[in-house]
Interface confidence: low
Amino acid sequence: YSIVTQITGPTTVNGLERGSLTVQCVYRSGWETYLKWWCRGAIWRDCKILVKTSGSEQEVKRDRVSIKDNQKNRTFTVTMEDLMKTDADTYWCGIEKTGNDLGVTVQVTIDPAPVTQEETSSSPTLTGHHLDNRHKLLKLS
């Protein structure tokens, strides 16, 4: 029974620059107590874990990424906020277990934010919207 699919997720997820995206990964019964993670990088063995659950349903947030496990529904949800073009990459929904972890790839693509009227005007004034994002980004450094 080694070929049984233990975890599934969307093949691709699309987000808007400066927006947020949500990925839902579904796992089979029996994995409720295991740690779930979200990692970045096309190569499975070398991907960088961005955020990991604590074994409970408590949401864990790290920088712009959060993860929350719903053990009853057997889904864990990853949210990426304040998206940047550079966030486009191959990611993995994963479950930590003895031996080899279980994982499924998710391709994340980022579309440029629609150009607003204020952005096309000659005035380079920073609007509140821009300031909010800038403050959030500054907090990350």
Epitope: Y1, L35, R74, T98
Partner: antibody, heavy 122, light 111 residues
């Protein structure tokens, strides 16, 4: 030899708590889950919940949430089930059982403890 | 919760004859092409012992006279030929979804 050795029978008063232990030997404790099952005299089996000694994560049957706390001590390869606010209908035999943690393969509870009898009496 | 209904509640079978125990689930316990159904035997004063897992696979050291079949919602455990040592309670269990649930049990005796 794989063994799950449970603590002895308990006679307890209503409203108190009791902690049942399940000591594992003969295998790598953190590589398998420990499940807990309740059996009232002459009755069927009820699944209480499961703990993953590797991660410390636990999952409870909704019916036993608040009544039961599952923990595991890696250093002594022992799993524990605490029952709180004991009532007469908590009187039962409680079993711990090992189940395969590598769910890439189908599993069932393959090794069981001998059971711990808990009697709630005033 | 997923409910498992076992029948009959008790059964008396002559030595050498066939015993058949049924288990019906309130919804399908199949997933990924596998039936998540187990069968346990419990003798008096002892813990349960797994006989069959994934509907039809015998557990380690389980004699060939025990066999399981079925898929979806209907499952059965067959014991043939019946031996004296088979006097026990038998339970089905589903592990398709939590909380895992057991059938009410079937008491098997010698006729």
């Amino acid at each position: 030899e794989i063994q799950l050795q449970q603590s002895g029978a308990e006679l307890v008063r209503p409203g108190t708590s009791v902690k049942v232990s399940c000591k594992a030997s003969g295998y790598a404790f953190t590589n398998y889950l420990i499940e807990w099952v309740k059996q009232r005299p002459g009755q069927g089996l009820e699944w209480i919940g499961v703990i993953n000694p590797g991660s410390g994560g636990s999952y409870y049957n909704e019916k036993f949430k608040g009544k039961t706390t599952l923990t595991a001590d890696k250093s002594s390869s022992t799993a524990y089930m605490q029952l709180s606010s004991l009532a007469f209908d908590d009187s039962a035999v409680y079993f711990c059982a090992r189940s395969e943690s590598n769910y890439s393969y189908y599993y069932a509870m393959d090794y069981w403890g001998q059971g711990t009898s808990v009697i709630v009496s005033s | 919760d997923l409910v498992l209904t076992q029948s009959p509640a008790s059964l008396a079978v002559s030595l050498g004859q066939r015993a058949t125990i049924s288990c019906r689930a309130s919804e399908s316990v199949d997933n990924y092409g596998i039936s998540f159904m187990n069968w346990f035997q419990q003798k008096s004063g002892q813990p349960p012992k797994v006989l069959i897992y994934a509907a039809s696979n015998r557990g380690s050291g389980v004699p060939a006279r025990f066999s399981g079949s079925g898929s979806g919602t209907d499952f059965s455990l067959n014991i043939h030929p019946m031996e004296e040592d088979d006097t026990a309670m038998y339970f089905c269990q589903q592990t398709k979804e939590v909380p895992y649930t057991f059938g009410g049990g079937t008491k098997l005796e010698i006729k």
